[in-house]
Protein backbone atom coordinates (compact mmCIF):
# COMPACT_ATOMS: atom_id res chain seq x y z
CA UNK A 1 0.00 0.00 0.00
CA UNK A 2 1.40 3.42 -0.76
CA UNK A 3 2.48 5.20 2.44
CA UNK A 4 -0.14 7.94 2.13
CA UNK A 5 -3.01 5.43 2.00
CA UNK A 6 -4.02 4.40 5.50
CA UNK A 7 -4.30 0.71 6.22
CA UNK A 8 -7.24 0.13 8.50
CA UNK A 9 -7.43 -2.73 10.97
CA UNK A 10 -9.38 -5.85 9.94
CA UNK A 11 -9.91 -4.34 6.52
CA UNK A 12 -11.27 -6.80 3.97
CA UNK A 13 -11.71 -4.06 1.36
CA UNK A 14 -8.04 -4.30 0.43
CA UNK A 15 -5.90 -7.39 -0.07
CA UNK A 16 -2.12 -7.13 -0.02
CA UNK A 17 0.73 -9.58 -0.34
CA UNK A 18 3.90 -9.55 1.77
CA UNK A 19 5.49 -6.90 -0.44
CA UNK A 20 2.49 -4.59 -0.06
CA UNK A 21 1.24 -5.17 -3.58
CA UNK A 22 -2.49 -4.54 -3.90
CA UNK A 23 -5.01 -6.89 -5.47
CA UNK A 24 -7.50 -5.26 -7.78
CA UNK A 25 -11.13 -6.31 -7.41
CA UNK A 26 -12.95 -8.57 -9.83
CA UNK A 27 -15.36 -7.24 -12.46
CA UNK A 28 -18.49 -9.40 -12.58
CA UNK A 29 -21.93 -9.42 -14.07
CA UNK A 30 -24.21 -8.50 -11.17
CA UNK A 31 -27.93 -8.50 -11.90
CA UNK A 32 -29.04 -10.60 -8.92
CA UNK A 33 -31.93 -12.89 -9.95
CA UNK A 34 -33.50 -12.47 -13.39
CA UNK A 35 -35.88 -14.61 -15.42
CA UNK A 36 -34.00 -16.50 -18.12
CA UNK A 37 -34.68 -18.27 -21.41
CA UNK A 38 -31.50 -20.33 -21.08
CA UNK A 39 -32.53 -23.99 -21.35
CA UNK A 40 -31.10 -27.12 -22.99
CA UNK A 41 -28.08 -25.26 -24.34
CA UNK A 42 -24.34 -25.98 -24.11
CA UNK A 43 -23.74 -22.40 -23.01
CA UNK A 44 -25.70 -19.22 -22.47
CA UNK A 45 -25.00 -15.52 -22.15
CA UNK A 46 -26.26 -13.91 -18.99
CA UNK A 47 -28.09 -11.04 -20.74
CA UNK A 48 -27.09 -8.97 -17.73
CA UNK A 49 -26.15 -5.45 -18.77
CA UNK A 50 -24.56 -4.51 -15.43
CA UNK A 51 -20.87 -5.21 -14.92
CA UNK A 52 -20.09 -4.31 -11.35
CA UNK A 53 -16.88 -3.86 -9.38
CA UNK A 54 -16.93 -6.46 -6.64
CA UNK A 55 -16.92 -4.85 -3.22
CA UNK A 56 -14.02 -6.91 -1.87
CA UNK A 57 -10.93 -7.90 -3.84
CA UNK A 58 -11.19 -11.53 -2.75
CA UNK A 59 -14.66 -11.92 -4.26
CA UNK A 60 -15.19 -13.89 -7.46
CA UNK A 61 -17.96 -14.05 -10.05
CA UNK A 62 -20.85 -16.46 -9.49
CA UNK A 63 -23.79 -17.59 -11.61
CA UNK A 64 -26.73 -19.67 -10.40
CA UNK A 65 -29.20 -21.27 -12.84
CA UNK A 66 -32.45 -22.62 -11.44
CA UNK A 67 -35.39 -24.33 -13.08
CA UNK A 68 -38.64 -25.38 -11.47
CA UNK A 69 -42.19 -26.10 -12.68
CA UNK A 70 -42.90 -22.40 -13.09
CA UNK A 71 -39.82 -20.66 -14.45
CA UNK A 72 -36.09 -20.49 -15.11
CA UNK A 73 -33.92 -17.91 -13.39
CA UNK A 74 -30.29 -16.89 -13.66
CA UNK A 75 -28.56 -15.14 -10.78
CA UNK A 76 -25.31 -13.25 -11.30
CA UNK A 77 -23.35 -11.88 -8.33
CA UNK A 78 -19.98 -11.33 -6.69
CA UNK A 79 -19.23 -13.54 -3.70
CA UNK A 80 -16.38 -14.38 -1.33
CA UNK A 81 -15.29 -17.98 -2.05
CA UNK A 82 -14.40 -18.48 1.60
CA UNK A 83 -18.12 -18.33 2.36
CA UNK A 84 -20.77 -20.77 1.12
CA UNK A 85 -23.36 -19.51 -1.34
CA UNK A 86 -26.83 -21.08 -1.34
CA UNK A 87 -25.28 -23.49 1.18
CA UNK A 88 -22.64 -24.67 -1.30
CA UNK A 89 -18.87 -24.12 -1.34
CA UNK A 90 -17.51 -22.34 -4.41
CA UNK A 91 -15.05 -25.10 -5.26
CA UNK A 92 -14.22 -23.82 -8.76
CA UNK A 93 -13.58 -20.19 -7.79
CA UNK A 94 -10.11 -20.12 -9.38
CA UNK A 95 -11.41 -21.20 -12.78
CA UNK A 96 -11.22 -18.59 -15.57
CA UNK A 97 -14.52 -19.90 -16.99
CA UNK A 98 -17.93 -20.40 -15.40
CA UNK A 99 -18.49 -24.15 -15.79
CA UNK A 100 -21.90 -25.08 -14.40
CA UNK A 101 -22.10 -27.94 -11.93
CA UNK A 102 -25.39 -29.45 -10.81
CA UNK A 103 -26.19 -29.28 -7.10
CA UNK A 104 -28.83 -31.21 -5.22
CA UNK A 105 -31.79 -29.02 -4.32
CA UNK A 106 -35.23 -30.49 -3.66
CA UNK A 107 -38.01 -29.41 -6.01
CA UNK A 108 -35.80 -27.79 -8.66
CA UNK A 109 -32.89 -28.23 -11.01
CA UNK A 110 -30.01 -26.18 -9.64
CA UNK A 111 -26.67 -25.41 -11.32
CA UNK A 112 -23.95 -23.11 -10.00
CA UNK A 113 -20.56 -21.93 -11.20
CA UNK A 114 -17.89 -19.52 -10.04
CA UNK A 115 -14.84 -18.08 -11.77
CA UNK A 116 -12.16 -15.44 -11.42
CA UNK A 117 -11.63 -13.61 -14.69
CA UNK A 118 -13.32 -10.35 -15.62
CA UNK A 119 -17.01 -10.79 -16.49
CA UNK A 120 -16.56 -14.56 -16.60
CA UNK A 121 -20.10 -15.13 -15.33
CA UNK A 122 -21.46 -13.53 -18.50
CA UNK A 123 -20.93 -16.81 -20.37
CA UNK A 124 -22.18 -19.82 -18.45
CA UNK A 125 -21.16 -23.23 -19.74
CA UNK A 126 -23.16 -26.43 -19.25
CA UNK A 127 -21.41 -28.59 -21.84
CA UNK A 128 -19.75 -31.79 -20.62
CA UNK A 129 -16.79 -31.22 -22.96
CA UNK A 130 -15.50 -28.56 -20.57
CA UNK A 131 -14.00 -29.61 -17.26
CA UNK A 132 -11.64 -28.23 -14.68
CA UNK A 133 -8.61 -29.74 -16.40
CA UNK A 134 -9.37 -27.94 -19.66
CA UNK A 135 -6.62 -25.31 -20.07
CA UNK A 136 -8.86 -23.04 -22.15
Amino acid sequence: IPPHVQKSVNNDMIVTDNNGAVKFPQLCKFCDVRFSTCDNQKSCMSNCSITSICEKPQEVCVAVWRKNDENITLETVCHDPKLPYHDFILEDAASPKCIMKEKKKPGETFFMCSCSSDECNDNIIFSEEYNTSNPD
Epitope: P2, D17, N19, G20, V22, K23
Partner: nanobody, 124 residues
Protein backbone atom coordinates in the same frame (compact mmCIF):
# COMPACT_ATOMS: atom_id res chain seq x y z
CA UNK B 1 8.89 9.56 -13.32
CA UNK B 2 5.32 8.35 -13.05
CA UNK B 3 2.88 10.86 -11.58
CA UNK B 4 -0.83 10.79 -10.87
CA UNK B 5 -2.18 14.09 -9.63
CA UNK B 6 -5.78 14.34 -8.45
CA UNK B 7 -7.71 17.58 -8.14
CA UNK B 8 -11.27 18.89 -7.89
CA UNK B 9 -12.16 17.85 -4.35
CA UNK B 10 -13.82 20.15 -1.88
CA UNK B 11 -16.79 20.74 0.37
CA UNK B 12 -20.21 20.21 -1.16
CA UNK B 13 -23.73 19.95 0.20
CA UNK B 14 -25.73 16.70 0.02
CA UNK B 15 -27.31 16.40 -3.42
CA UNK B 16 -24.56 18.49 -4.98
CA UNK B 17 -22.02 17.66 -7.66
CA UNK B 18 -18.24 17.65 -8.09
CA UNK B 19 -15.90 16.73 -10.91
CA UNK B 20 -12.57 15.18 -10.04
CA UNK B 21 -9.59 15.09 -12.39
CA UNK B 22 -6.44 12.98 -12.40
CA UNK B 23 -3.55 14.18 -14.55
CA UNK B 24 -1.23 11.33 -15.52
CA UNK B 25 2.36 11.55 -16.73
CA UNK B 26 5.46 9.42 -17.05
CA UNK B 27 3.78 6.35 -18.55
CA UNK B 28 1.78 5.37 -21.62
CA UNK B 29 -1.71 6.33 -20.46
CA UNK B 30 -3.46 4.39 -23.23
CA UNK B 31 -2.03 1.08 -21.98
CA UNK B 32 -3.71 1.18 -18.58
CA UNK B 33 -7.12 0.58 -17.12
CA UNK B 34 -7.67 3.51 -14.76
CA UNK B 35 -9.48 3.45 -11.43
CA UNK B 36 -11.00 5.80 -8.92
CA UNK B 37 -10.60 4.44 -5.40
CA UNK B 38 -11.72 6.12 -2.20
CA UNK B 39 -11.00 5.87 1.50
CA UNK B 40 -13.44 7.27 4.04
CA UNK B 41 -12.04 8.35 7.42
CA UNK B 42 -11.09 5.28 9.44
CA UNK B 43 -12.34 2.91 6.75
CA UNK B 44 -10.76 0.69 4.13
CA UNK B 45 -10.33 1.34 0.44
CA UNK B 46 -13.44 1.21 -1.73
CA UNK B 47 -13.03 0.61 -5.44
CA UNK B 48 -15.41 3.13 -6.98
CA UNK B 49 -15.07 3.05 -10.75
CA UNK B 50 -12.84 1.88 -13.59
CA UNK B 51 -12.45 2.60 -17.29
CA UNK B 52 -10.69 0.62 -20.01
CA UNK B 53 -7.76 2.19 -21.87
CA UNK B 54 -9.41 2.01 -25.29
CA UNK B 55 -13.11 1.85 -26.10
CA UNK B 56 -14.04 3.51 -22.83
CA UNK B 57 -15.93 0.60 -21.27
CA UNK B 58 -16.78 1.65 -17.74
CA UNK B 59 -17.47 -0.13 -14.46
CA UNK B 60 -18.92 1.04 -11.16
CA UNK B 61 -19.36 -0.10 -7.59
CA UNK B 62 -22.99 -0.70 -6.72
CA UNK B 63 -22.84 2.10 -4.15
CA UNK B 64 -22.27 4.75 -6.85
CA UNK B 65 -24.03 3.20 -9.85
CA UNK B 66 -26.19 5.79 -11.63
CA UNK B 67 -24.69 8.72 -9.69
CA UNK B 68 -21.03 8.74 -10.75
CA UNK B 69 -19.61 8.81 -14.27
CA UNK B 70 -16.00 7.97 -15.08
CA UNK B 71 -14.38 9.19 -18.28
CA UNK B 72 -10.93 9.76 -19.73
CA UNK B 73 -9.32 11.99 -22.32
CA UNK B 74 -6.42 10.03 -23.78
CA UNK B 75 -5.22 13.08 -25.72
CA UNK B 76 -4.76 14.92 -22.42
CA UNK B 77 -3.67 11.92 -20.33
CA UNK B 78 -6.43 12.79 -17.89
CA UNK B 79 -8.98 10.75 -15.96
CA UNK B 80 -12.25 12.26 -14.67
CA UNK B 81 -14.98 11.37 -12.19
CA UNK B 82 -18.25 13.26 -12.38
CA UNK B 83 -20.04 12.83 -9.06
CA UNK B 84 -23.73 13.76 -8.84
CA UNK B 85 -26.35 13.40 -6.10
CA UNK B 86 -23.60 13.31 -3.51
CA UNK B 87 -24.32 11.83 -0.08
CA UNK B 88 -22.60 12.13 3.29
CA UNK B 89 -21.28 8.58 2.85
CA UNK B 90 -19.37 9.71 -0.26
CA UNK B 91 -17.06 11.72 2.02
CA UNK B 92 -13.57 10.31 1.48
CA UNK B 93 -10.15 10.88 0.00
CA UNK B 94 -10.36 9.95 -3.69
CA UNK B 95 -7.34 8.43 -5.40
CA UNK B 96 -6.73 7.51 -8.99
CA UNK B 97 -4.83 4.32 -9.71
CA UNK B 98 -3.61 2.49 -12.77
CA UNK B 99 -3.83 -1.17 -13.69
CA UNK B 100 -2.45 -3.14 -16.59
CA UNK B 101 -5.58 -4.86 -17.95
CA UNK B 102 -5.63 -8.52 -16.99
CA UNK B 103 -3.05 -8.10 -14.22
CA UNK B 104 -4.61 -8.73 -10.84
CA UNK B 105 -1.90 -7.22 -8.65
CA UNK B 106 0.11 -4.03 -8.55
CA UNK B 107 3.85 -4.54 -8.74
CA UNK B 108 5.12 -3.71 -5.25
CA UNK B 109 4.79 -1.44 -2.26
CA UNK B 110 6.75 1.45 -3.79
CA UNK B 111 4.65 1.36 -6.93
CA UNK B 112 3.87 4.47 -8.85
CA UNK B 113 0.30 3.25 -9.06
CA UNK B 114 -1.45 5.79 -6.87
CA UNK B 115 -1.90 9.52 -6.69
CA UNK B 116 -1.80 11.53 -3.46
CA UNK B 117 -5.58 11.87 -3.36
CA UNK B 118 -8.13 14.69 -3.20
CA UNK B 119 -10.52 15.13 -0.28
CA UNK B 120 -14.26 15.23 -0.94
CA UNK B 121 -16.44 16.31 1.99
CA UNK B 122 -20.22 16.08 1.69
CA UNK B 123 -21.87 17.98 4.50
CA UNK B 124 -24.59 20.54 5.09
Amino acid sequence: EVQLLESGGGLVQPGGSLRLSCAASGFTFTEYRMWWVRQAPGKGLEWVSAIEPIGNRTYYARSVYGRFTISRDNSKNTLYLQMNSLRAEDTAVYYCAKQIPGRKWTANSRFDYWGQGTLVTVSS
